[in-house]
Interface confidence: low
């Protein structure tokens, strides 16, 4: 294989937004290999060496009035500007989740099982998934994959409930998400094999 | 207080491969990247291009600067090379699997550096190229990389799939397997 040594340079310009664009923090960061060497932080107001490797750059950039002024203005000229350009298709993007409930194994009643609530294809990632048994929230015995980013501007998550289903029981998966005004619910009845959407 | 949103302009330049990347990230998703060979902006979702524009030439200029700066830093560091960090690989589907219902296999390659990987989809052990797609290298908060590869497929009980990943941090190619997990049939006596 190719065993030549590799050398990597990674600049990152980060804009962190709090409460819309009310508070903005700009970071201009430079990484050699995996190590940050120098950065500008708008909360600091000047370039700082993170490692000795970045000291010449910090000193040089701080000595250049134009570079420093440009960096100090970036919260507005760069961050707030880009937020405004992209807001409609990023910040405001909403995609409704698809909710499906199924048992992980097809087991007879009164056998230990795992009920799966699959929530997929949603955006943004903030979501609340709850399990109810006969209208009462189940807080114990819940296992989750956590939030999974699909890389295509959608998320998915699986929230499992460890249970021993009994005849007549109604299990409900409830999903709250910014794309919907009221929670989405899907029921699974211990008698039936299929989940029906409400 | 945790921020609501983060936008990152992430770039890299890698020697001696002379590979570079310029992309914008919003909360961990790619908004666009610039195709260095075609010198054009590639929007992650086609509709994004209807709302905004980005002059690709600016990214090319940045990459030229990145290349020069990498040479400076390489020398300044007394030619200290990067340490290979091997990827973690996960294969999952886009949505719950139903037989003969179109779905997408996702190969998620995570926590690796440098940003060079060779990824191959295998169906029943043979390479598949039809319909496959991939993302560029995506930044992580720890300054390692992530990458997604996709394979649209029709789930069946006959086919098995593997995502095969090669990286300098791995001693041998890493294969992550996926196959249809058919639920065992209900005993007839159930009720």
């Amino acid at each position: 294989g190719d065993t030549r040594p590799r050398f990597l340079w990674q600049p990152k310009r980060e804009c962190h937004f709090f409460n819309g664009t009310e508070r903005v923090r700009f970071l201009d960061r430079y990484f050699y290999n995996q190590e940050e060497s120098v950065r500008f932080d708008s909360d600091v107001g000047e370039f700082r060496a993170v490692t000795e490797l970045g000291r010449p750059d910090a000193e040089y950039w701080n000595s250049q009035k134009d570079i420093l002024e440009q960096a100090r203005a970036a919260v507005d000229t760069y961050c707030r500007h880009n937020y405004g350009v992209g807001e409609s298709f990023t910040v405001q993007r909403r995609v409704q989740p698809k909710v499906t409930v199924y048992p992980s194994k097809t087991q007879p009643l009164q056998h230990h099982n795992l009920l799966v609530c699959s929530v997929s294809g949603f955006y943004p990632g903030s979501i609340e998934v709850r399990w109810f048994l006969n209208g009462q929230e189940e807080k114990a015995g819940m296992v989750s994959t956590g939030l999974i980013q699909n890389g295509d501007w959608t998320f998915q998550t699986l929230v499992m409930l460890e249970t021993v289903p009994r005849s007549g029981e109604v299990y409900t998966c409830q999903v709250e998400h910014p794309s919907v005004t009221s929670p989405l619910t899907v029921e699974w009845r211990a008698r039936s094999e299929s989940a029906q959407s409400k | 207080i945790k921020e609501e949103h983060v936008i990152i302009q992430a770039e890299f330049y890698l020697n001696p491969d002379q590979s570079g990347e310029f992309m914008f990230d919003f909360d961990g998703d790619e908004i666009f990247h610039v195709d260095m060979a075609k010198k054009e902006t590639v929007w992650r979702l086609e509709e994004f291009g209807r709302f905004a524009s980005f002059e690709a030439q600016g990214a090319l200029a940045n990459i030229a600067v990145d290349k020069a700066n990498l040479e400076i830093m390489t020398k300044r560091s007394n030619y200290t090379p990067i340490t290979n960090v091997p990827p973690e690989v996960t294969v999952l589907t886009n949505s719950p699997v139903e037989l003969r219902e179109p779905n997408v296999l996702i190969c998620f390659i995570d926590k690796f550096t440098p940003p060079v990987v060779n990824v191959t989809w295998l169906r029943n052990g043979k390479p598949v190229t039809t319909g496959v797609s991939e993302t560029v290298f995506l930044p992580r908060e720890d300054h390692l990389f992530r990458k997604f590869h996709y394979l649209p497929f029709l789930p069946s009980t006959e086919d098995v799939y593997d995502c095969r990943v090669e990286h300098w941090g791995l001693d041998e190619p890493l294969l992550k397997h996926w196959e249809f997990d058919a639920p065992s049939p209900l005993p007839e006596t159930t009720e």
Partner: antibody, heavy 120, light 109 residues
Framework: QVQLKESGPALVKPTQTLTLTCTFS??????????VGWIRQPPGKALEWLAL???????YYSTSLKTRLTISKDTSKNQVVLTMTNMDPVDTATYYC????????????WGQGTLVTVSS | DIVLTQPPSVSGAPGQRVTISCSGS????????VTWYQQLPGTAPKLLIY???QRPSGVPDRFSGSKSGTSASLAITGLQSEDEADYYC?????????FGGGTKLTVLG
Amino acid sequence: QVQLKESGPALVKPTQTLTLTCTFSGFSLSTSGVGVGWIRQPPGKALEWLALIDWDDDKYYSTSLKTRLTISKDTSKNQVVLTMTNMDPVDTATYYCARSPRYRGAFDYWGQGTLVTVSS
Amino acid sequence: DIVLTQPPSVSGAPGQRVTISCSGSESNIGANYVTWYQQLPGTAPKLLIYDNNQRPSGVPDRFSGSKSGTSASLAITGLQSEDEADYYCQSYDYDHYVFGGGTKLTVLG
């Protein structure tokens, strides 16, 4: 403040060796990233880069003049010396030394230049 | 060796805008920063623009630099008589600094 000054003979004969000294102040050639270079300019012509020495004693030379040039530094004296062998009348020029504040950086401060005439 | 190509001369009337081009290749301008120097008659060159488009302190904002691919340009707006000088572009090619042939700017009138 940063200052550089070139010194050396104003007149050299063909085939002789030219030795030029650049004495500088206001910065140190031991600072990471810093370099000192030599550039010349024949009368009425363009600037031509000759050589550069950087903080860790790496030396870079113009391809076309490489065999004739030697650059060295004395960090304690704040001096950089350029020697050029086998001088020819076409080497008649104003010779400048200049500082580069970072590796592969621009020349941000220049000396006033010294005119060297090559004639028998 | 002159590796970067500049027009030998440009001219403009006071108050006008002029541009000076500098053409190179992938291995120099295409891969590295571009610097511009101003040389007034009988003096040493002075740094005007570095890192493609950055102005050192004290350089008026009438001077601006840009780079696109393997070419760069220097723009001077609101031309003044004291801008009459020679202008040189400079970049880097592998381990070598490279200069342009210089452009003489004449301010008319």
